[in-house]
Interface confidence: medium
Amino acid sequence: QQQTLPKPFIWAEPHFMVPKEKQVTICCQGNYGAVEYQLHFEGSLFAVDRPKPPERINKVQFYIPDMNSRMAGQYSCIYRVGELWSEPSNLLDLVVTEMYDTPTLSVHPGPEVISGEKVTFYCRLDTATSMFLLLKEGRSSHVQRGYGKVQAEFPLGPVTTAHRGTYRCFGSYNNHAWSFPSEPVKLLVTGDIENTSLAPEDPTFPADTWGTYLLTTETGLQKDHALWDHTAQNLLR
């Protein structure tokens, strides 16, 4: 006898990173026939939705019209069919950005390098934060975490053409409150020192510093959000 239903999927639209005072919708996708969905925030019941008619709806939306630091944190959802509850979804880390200040991102030796060169990004912010985040834009965006009093180093090591792309950094006041993004820095990697055709689409980084964020980007929106479970956010655990 099945004691619980499969866990629902949870994600944020348009993004789990939400600028302060902007809107975000938390979506929870369960099963058709679910009579009740519950959204939990930081372990506490936050909202309830009862879809009508339940047999025609398998997804509910919880709209947040005004994002702020109080609403940033970990969300999960569950649903009920009859008297049977689902397993809880994975955790969704909702981050508020555009808090306080803007960091400066620089790259050494420069934004145009040859494949195989060692590249280091520097993120600097002169206000009270000691954690910094470096994001590479893209369909499967990576986030690297760094520490420092006013500046963090992000050594990429010897780069390949797979490192090409646009980078931004944030200062992090806590796990769920980030600064304004830095101005973007575009890294151009040229040359063919190694066989770059074998390079992965996104380079592999040390497991202790990198968490994979599956982001819905403007260029790669995927309608089946079950595949875009934004809770693969190991970084914020």
């Epitope: 925030f41 372990g43 909202a47 709209y63 019209p65 005004d66 994002m67 702020n68």
Partner: antibody, heavy 122, light 107 residues
Framework: QMQLVQSGGGLVQPGRSLRLSCAAS????????IHWVRQAPGKGLEWVSG????????GYADSVKGRFTISRDNGKNSLYLQMNSLRAEDTAVYYC???????????????WGQGTMVTVSS | DIQMTQSPSSLSASVGDRVTITCRAS??????LAWYQQKPGKAPKLLIY???RLESGVPSRFSGSGSGTDFTLTISSLQPEDFATYYC?????????FGQGTKVEIK
């Protein structure tokens, strides 16, 4: 800074009506549910009524249901409580209070008005 | 409606004392509980929400704990400005309901 400024209290006879107002500033009024909470002299706090961020949902305590009406005008950043058929037991300080979370979540109240006294007596 | 019961209804304490106020819900409310401080003639002030999250600007000597039905507000070292009445409030379901209050007086 965020604040709620109340007006409209006073002395009223039983069976008569009164309208309370609450003007908001310093935050995005249209994003937050606002509630009324009252406190009878020497007593504790009692929730009276609430309205969600867009006015689409309202709620009332059983003791005022059918007599009080809550409304809001997001264009004017204002909240109202229309109190009809007032009774002696409605005598209290009435506070408007903002939900701590935008949207329709968690009715913990982080910003309160200064309170306005409503006295129902003949 | 969910009933909230606070204890004690009043207490006397001295500056520097550790003070604990408890609140019990008539049914489980997860951690959807807030604590307020109210001084005579003033509006209540939010101290703690979601049972243990300290409201911005509130001194760290205030802390909250608990989940389900039993909750605690602790003032680690009572200060002169802390003499007031404290209320718990559940924000789990409508209508939100308050405890009857605990008056903290000077010994």
């Amino acid at each position: 800074q965020m604040q709620l400024v109340q007006s409209g209290g006073g002395l009223v006879q039983p069976g008569r009506s009164l309208r309370l107002s609450c003007a908001a500033s310093g935050f995005t009024f249209s994003s937050y549910g606002i509630h009324w909470v009252r406190q009878a002299p020497g007593k504790g706090l009692e929730w009276v009524s609430g309205i969600n961020w867009n006015g689409g949902s309202t709620g009332y305590a059983d003791s005022v249901k059918g007599r009080f009406t809550i409304s809001r005008d997001n264009g004017k950043n204002s909240l109202y409580l229309q109190m009809n058929s007032l009774r002696a037991e409605d005598t209290a300080v009435y506070y408007c209070a903002k939900r701590a979370y935008s949207g329709d979540y968690y009715a913990a109240f982080d910003i309160w008005g200064q309170g306005t006294m409503v006295t129902v007596s003949s | 409606d969910i009933q909230m019961t606070q204890s004690p209804s009043s207490l006397s304490a001295s500056v520097g004392d550790r003070v604990t106020i408890t609140c019990r819900a008539s049914q489980g409310i997860s951690n959807a509980l807030a604590w307020y401080q109210q001084k005579p003639g003033k509006a209540p002030k939010l101290l703690i929400y979601a049972a243990s999250r300290l409201e911005s600007g509130v001194p760290s000597r205030f802390s909250g704990s608990g989940s389900g039905t039993d909750f605690t507000l602790t003032i680690s070292s009572l200060q002169p400005e802390d003499f007031a009445t404290y209320y718990c409030q559940q924000h789990y379901s409508t209508p939100p309901t308050f405890g009857q209050g605990t008056k903290v007086e000077i010994k």
